[in-house]
Amino acid sequence: SSPCPQAWGPPGVQYGQPGRSVKLCCPGVTAGDPVSWFRDGEPKLLQGPDSGLGHELVLAQADSTDEGTYICQTLDGALGGTVTLQLGYPPARPVVSCQAADYENFSCTWSPSQISGLPTRYLTSYRKKTVLGADSQRRSPSTGPWPCPQDPLGAARCVVHGAEFWSQYRINVTEVNPLGASTRLLDVSLQSILRPDPPQGLRVESVPGYPRRLRASWTYPASWPCQPHFLLKFRLQYRPAQHPAWSTVEPAGLEEVITDAVAGLPHAVRVSARDFLDAGTWSTWSPEAWGTPSTGTIPKEIPAWGQLHTQPEVEPQVDSPAPPRPSLQPHPRLLDHRDSVEQVAVLA
């Protein structure tokens, strides 16, 4: 059997670090057998069989000019094998970050903090850490590790499904190459990394007869679980065209009636979402939707929601079309505490 341990990587390739001494091993001989070494395609002898180094070739302070293919021959001139030298660096700890768009799953992404120049793979796993006792800061032996399944096609991402919202997890991402391994451990809790996707289906409509009103409505992001144990709260911003500053309100539910719009001007509206108990951070803003308040006077009778909905002054603008998801809408009493006359209409 070969005296050369096979490093992880393609067969026939051996590895070293620039600036360091490198030993190449002749694969087709018995350990200690004296061999001669040549560069492939060059007749010049690099190291003879009388070197005392047996089946190994030593290159002091290797540099890029030493990379390439080497040939070793036994005393009788038989081919002992060919070896390709590739230089690079041991792994450095990767940089890892984790994020969650809902309270049941999270993903972690990583990047090398230094390129090694060598074939590299990543091992990803996680443990669940549990606290012993409500008042205790001691941690029980963690459970796991379990693999953190990586995305196919080599994307630097792995996903933990079915995570527990109140638990802490320790993520292990280990960068491995033929010269070694280096591990980054990252402690994460779903509560701190939760960042919902932005709300979807944002529509901005005029309220006929109310020249200073706009009605905005939206739905939960599709990534939020269909039967949510945790609700989202929302933040809405609006501003007239050409106006630099946003006005901000926190709606009670999935719609908001803006009562101080500037008559006759188009308004940009955007919404953001966050866990209703303030876990994690606000989502990014949704794409902006636009609407212009209606012109004209207040009608004698307040039209019903259906009528309003079918005759908006401005065609509703939908940036991210999404079907309505009534199962995601909390009870109407959670949505609105305003007088129905002031609001003109409530959610169906």
């Epitope: 450095a92 990047s111 903090s113 230094q114």
Partner: antibody
Amino acid sequence: EVQLLESGGGLVQPGGSLRLSCAASGFTFSWYSMTWVRQAPGKGLEWVSSIVPSGGHTQYADSVKGRFTISRDNSKNTLYLQMNSLRAEDTAVYYCAKGPGWGQFAVWGRGTLVTVSS
Amino acid sequence: DIQMTQSPSSLSASVGDRVTITCQASQDINNYLNWYQQKPGKAPKLLIYDASNLQTGVPSRFSGSGSGTDFTFTISSLQPEDIATYYCQQYDNLSPTFGPGTKVDIK
């Protein structure tokens, strides 16, 4: 010889913006994480921001988060720091530093002075 | 963030003296600690990495030790050119932090 050369510093009013550059030479720039570290006059060193070789991960000190943006152009061997909404407390010499890995600063530039004052 | 403390904040010693600086982390940082030297008007220079490894080209009178939360930096025989401020720095997590520095001068 490995070299880092910062530029772009100067006097700016509070609320203003500056973009610092760091030109790298003598090594394979695209292989290394890069960092900005600053030092206020007569004070200690403060890490500002770091970026991985691909640019895919960045990290910022709380004191600059949301105001500063680190970026890199590997084709130009250059690191950048875009500084917006500058405050008097951002006055410092800004150093560019090279890895090996993340958080190790084996090579430093000479620094560029940023003064925020009205 | 991980806080780093250094002591003493300054010291005076004679040429040839053994000088010791300590650095303490607010939590376990394994051996992810570097030591830097900064001379007046100059950029910092890495002396010790991973708590105890001497950076290439740095004189052997400089050494470091420690792991976890407590670390020590030693100059075995102080030389006039060692007048500088010395900083420890952790990189256990993704937000590196420096100690406040120790100013070393000659008596």
